[in-house]
């Protein structure tokens, strides 16, 4: 009967040696792909000299196989019933899944130029910084190929500066032979209901780049929930990606090969200003960027990318106030692309499909003191690229599931 | 209330090294540029060089280059500038001056004179 | 390196009357000019600032105008205390650089 069935389920999901969930938990069984889309500025020349609307063109998919390696330094403590791992980071390009290559050619903001005049905002270090930027020919925009932009190249204005900095610029740099931790999570052994929860990251319960309640580290990794999840219910997790807690609401109910599961959707609500959703007002860090804390649908990570302005979005800046995309041309935002969810299974709490859908954009900012940014008239957050991170439970782990799981409840 | 406090004036003789300090109060010492001007008697006023207290970042004007190194120490709030191979050339009123936000020159030194004399 | 060329080197002017004192850079400054005042035995003082901002404090008969290449220093009904000498200093860029000065002195 369901008494069995459940303690079944309970037993087979605890994070322990010998378990279903331990085995799919440490190496994923299911193949994830990372998509890129670059946006290309298809008019630097206007947008840096009359400070003009920015056209930008997304180009891809770029595709890269990622989460393939299994978790490190796995260690079970019997005591508070927690196991503790690194996740290590991986990324393999997938030229038959990609419309070119790793070297193809992408005009975008300059990454360093932008993020040195913002996080050295004294007039006379910008003055510096201006002698070198244009001592290295640098300019506002750039143009790098995919594999420089997403993993890292010398950046040749950084390259001169006269004090320690890091010279190697990349929106993920460093990323291969890297790892995401130290994670520890509950293992359920003593109460099922915290199953996959977060205790500590990094050694700590807060992330110390937020004000009271958003600086918690809230839930699981997504990767799965405690079993049993209700409709209901708010799903809780943390993405180390955009620095922050987040959480999902049920939107539907979905058939995934075979398997009932519910969708899980990030609701507008969660990027909404503290106007519209008073709990967010931790994450308006500034005033200027944020009008007041008006703007909405886009989260400064400044805090957590040691100063650097990136700003994390929806794709297409979905779920964004208009003040933040009027500025940019070309964008096209709808919810069934841009947005994220997750199909879980209810009765054990495993994510069998997701789609993880954000947008990595860079703030710059006028300034008097350096040239190429002097005819500025606005601050920009400049689109770089936007990523699809799915993943889609195998046709024979779905088999396997279906007979063991969904098929012994029905 | 911000203070420029410099040392006392300097005889000095050809070829020597002289090291002037520049103590400050009332403000918050390492987000501010603070920056060296030389006065030569009944002259003009020449920008030597500033630094960044936060970073260390300097830059020289390049008459002064290898003849002016500016330093700080952050524990005592004082800034310094080190003049060396000393000519009559460089007998002047030295000042130093820090910034204000996004003004220059906000903030002077009493001055320090340095007199270069066999 | 952009030269600042200030004139005139020295003037003599009545109380009361009107002062006019000029820089002219060799590169475009857009309005990067400041304006100082030294009296004798004394450090020099920050009157007017990039954007021609008048100082906290400063008299409001000191005014500067200008934008590019020319910059005009004005003192309105001159006082026996404005007697010093006056400096403009380009901040646009590095490294600054000063005028040459102006004494100004009472008839």
């Known amino acids: 009967g369901d008494l069995l069935i459940q303690k079944t389920i309970k037993k087979q999901v605890v994070l322990e040696e010998g378990t279903i969930a331990f085995k799919n938990w440490v190496k994923t069984g299911t193949e994830v792909y990372r998509q890129f889309w670059i946006f290309d500025v298809q008019n630097p020349q206007e947008v840096m000299m009359n400070s003009s609307n920015i056209q930008v063109k997304q180009r891809g998919p770029y595709t890269y196989r990622v989460r393939f390696l299994a978790k490190e330094n796995v260690t079970q403590d019997a005591e508070d019933n927690t196991v503790s791992f690194l996740q290590p980071n991986g990324a393999i390009f997938e030229p038959s899944l990609s419309v070119g290559t790793e070297a193809d050619n992408f005009t975008v903001l300059n990454l360093a130029v932008a993020a040195a005049s913002h996080i050295y905002q004294n007039q006379f270090v910008q003055m510096i910084l201006n002698s070198l930027i244009n001592k290295s020919k640098s300019s506002m925009f750039q143009v790098r190929t995919l594999r420089e932009l997403l993993w890292g190249y010398r950046d040749p204005f950084l390259s001169l500066v006269p004090y320690p900095v890091t010279t190697t610029v990349g929106l993920f740099y460093p990323y291969n032979n890297t790892a995401d931790g130290v994670y520890k999570v509950f293992n359920g052994k003593d109460n099922i209901s915290k199953v996959a929860i977060i205790d500590t990251y990094k050694g700590k319960r807060n992330l110390s780049y937020w004000e009271s309640h958003c600086d918690m580290i809230n839930g699981t990794d997504a990767a799965s929930f405690p079993p049993f999840v209700e409709k209901s219910q708010v799903l809780q997790f943390f993405s180390s990606d955009i620095c922050r807690s987040i959480y999902a609401v049920f939107e539907s109910d979905v058939n995934l090969k075979g398997i009932p599961v519910y969708r899980f959707v990030l609701p507008s609500k969660a990027f909404a200003s503290p106007v519209e959703n008073p709990d967010n007002y931790c994450f308006c860090t500034e005033k200027i960027i944020s009008k007041n804390c008006t703007s909405y649908g886009v989260l400064d990570i400044s805090k957590c990318k040691e100063g650097r302005p990136v700003y994390i979005s929806l794709p297409h800046f979905l779920y964004a106030s208009p003040d933040v995309s009027e500025p940019i041309d070309g964008l096209n935002p709808n919810e069934e692309e841009h947005r994220t969810y997750l199909d879980i299974e209810p009765i054990t709490g495993f994510t069998l499909q997701f789609a993880k859908r954000l947008q990595v954009n860079l703030l710059v900012k006028p300034s008097e003191k350096i040239q190429v940014l002097k005819n500025l008239k606005r601050n920009y957050i400049v689109p770089i690229l936007w990523l699809n991170e799915t993943g889609t439970i195998g046709d024979e782990k779905a088999n396997m599931f279906r007979s063991q799981v969904t098929g012994k409840i029905n | 209330e911000v203070q420029l406090q410099q040392s006392g004036p300097e005889l000095v003789k050809p070829g020597a090294s002289v090291k002037i300090s520049c103590e400050t109060s009332?403000?918050?010492?390492?987000?501010?540029?603070m920056h060296w001007v030389k006065q030569s008697h009944g002259k003009s006023l020449e920008w030597i060089g500033g630094?960044?207290?936060?970073?260390?970042?300097?830059k020289y004007n390049q008459k002064f280059k290898g003849k002016a190194t500016l330093t700080v120490d952050k524990s005592s709030s004082t800034a310094y500038m080190e003049l060396r191979s000393l000519t009559s050339e460089d007998s002047a009123v030295y000042y130093c001056?820090?910034?204000?936000?996004?003004?220059?020159?906000?903030?002077w030194g009493q001055g320090t004179l340095v007199t270069v004399s066999a | 390196e952009t030269t600042v060329t200030q004139s005139p080197a020295s003037l003599s002017m009545a109380i009361g009357e009107k002062v006019t004192i000029r820089c002219i850079t060799s590169?475009?400054?857009?309005?990067?000019m400041n304006w100082y005042q030294q009296k004798p035995g004394e450090p020099p003082k920050l009157l007017i600032s990039?954007?021609?901002t008048l100082r906290p404090g400063v008299p409001s008969r000191f005014s500067s105008s200008g934008y590019g290449t020319d910059f005009v220093f004005t003192i309105e009904n001159l006082l026996s205390e404005d007697v010093a000498d006056y400096y403009c200093?380009?901040?646009?860029?590095?490294?600054?650089?000063f005028g040459g000065g102006t004494k100004l002195e009472i008839k």
């Open positions: 630094i960044y207290p936060n970073n260390g970042a300097t």
């Open positions: 009332g403000h918050t010492f390492t987000e501010y540029t």
């Open positions: 590169t475009d400054i857009d309005d990067d």
């Open positions: 200093l380009q901040s646009d860029n590095l490294p600054l650089t």
């Open positions: 990039e954007g021609n």
């Open positions: 001056a820090r910034d204000r936000y996004d003004v220059w020159f906000a903030y």
